[in-house]
Interface confidence: low
């Protein structure tokens, strides 16, 4: 089964994926790939974490949550119709065949011609002063210039609160449907 998530062209898409570290900082490698989860690893890897860091990513793919607490949800910036499809979040738990695999279906809708003043569901637009990521062409530059004087703990707390409310809203608004 796969869970379906929706975003509009030009928005940031959010694909949730979580695990509970055995102990704080005791991280498990995670990979995100485009395409359904294969038997091992991730196909077409777009982002990867290891036991310590986010150590690989490609343009427009970010972890905005606190991956050190097990929030490895993927944000895809400024989506296009080509971003539609299945994404694999693979939590690489040590041991034979222990991996947790999640297939998430991303459906991209064309942007509305007249944007309505609806509730903002995009993390970075909802809190532009908290954490803003911007792509700047091939250099894949990220700017955190609008970050106020708050520490990582505050960021993760805000992110967790936002994530929890967003997940609830997404389910309530039928943004996610279990297949």
């Amino acid at each position: 089964s796969e869970v379906e998530y929706r975003a509009e062209v030009g928005q940031n898409a959010y694909l949730p994926c979580f695990y509970t570290p055995a102990a704080p900082g005791n991280l498990v490698p995670v990979c995100w790939g485009k395409g359904a989860c294969p038997v091992f690893e991730c196909g077409n890897v777009v982002l990867r974490t290891d036991e310590r860091d986010v150590n690989y990513w490609t343009s427009r793919y970010w972890l905005n949550g606190d991956f050190r607490k097990g929030d490895v949800s993927l944000t895809i910036e400024n989506v296009t119709l080509a971003d539609s499809g299945i994404y694999c979040c693979r939590i690489q738990i040590p041991g034979i065949m222990n991996d947790e695999k999640f297939n998430l279906k991303l459906v991209i809708k064309p942007a509305k011609v007249t944007p309505a003043p609806t509730r903002q569901r995009d993390f970075t637009a909802a809190f532009p002063r908290m954490l803003t990521t911007r792509g700047h062409g091939p250099a894949e530059t990220q700017t955190l210039g609008s970050l106020p004087d708050i520490n990582l703990t505050q960021i993760s707390t805000l992110a967790n609160e936002l994530r929890d409310s967003r997940l609830a809203n997404d389910l309530r608004d039928s943004g996610a449907t279990i297949r």
Partner: antibody, heavy 114, light 110 residues
Framework: QVQLVQSGAEVKKPGSSVKVSCKAS????????IYWVRQAPGQGLEWMGS????????NYAQKFQGRVTITADESTSTAYMELSSLRSEDTAVYYC???????WGQGTLVTVSS | QAVVTQEPSLTVSPGGTVTLTCASS?????????PNWFQQRPGQAPRALIY???NRHSWTPARFSGSLLGGKAALTLSGVQPEDEADYYC?????????FGGGTKLTVLG
Amino acid sequence: QVQLVQSGAEVKKPGSSVKVSCKASGGTFSSYTIYWVRQAPGQGLEWMGSIIPILGTANYAQKFQGRVTITADESTSTAYMELSSLRSEDTAVYYCASASHTIWGQGTLVTVSS
Amino acid sequence: QAVVTQEPSLTVSPGGTVTLTCASSTGAVTSGYTPNWFQQRPGQAPRALIYTTSNRHSWTPARFSGSLLGGKAALTLSGVQPEDEADYYCLLYYGGAWVFGGGTKLTVLG
């Protein structure tokens, strides 16, 4: 567009240490991994280690473990690579790179000679 | 630590096609190793060409393509130009560490 500007060439004695800096200009690099790569004269590229400035944690290649320290100062958008117990075979151009290895500094030549 | 092996040197005629490969001492290279390819001309810093096996950067000419071939990562240059003469390096990811291949010196005849 972000550019990485490295410190100038250094000449060091065997057994000493060197600290090379890598400053990001035109943007911040806080959430990007900064990689350090070296290249000895006429030789290939060698990955030394990396750091994500906003987290402050570094990864090191096994070969350099215990001899290299990679740090970052977010306030100045600068990453540093310090290599200790230098020997002649550490003579190389040292590069910093960022944004999935798409942005590279100009390189810093470190010469180790008695 | 893993060893990544490339052909030390290859020669190609202008307009021809050449394939550079990248093998891992740990076994077959898969997309999980997120193969990257770089070009380096004398006196210059490396320039990224391909990421995650087969994805070209926006500045990478279409004549460069990446793939997996017989358990190795591969970089194919089609319609080789004189300016493609350079050193080429692959880079593989091994759970927490990156390892470069030894590099391939590509010579374009003429």
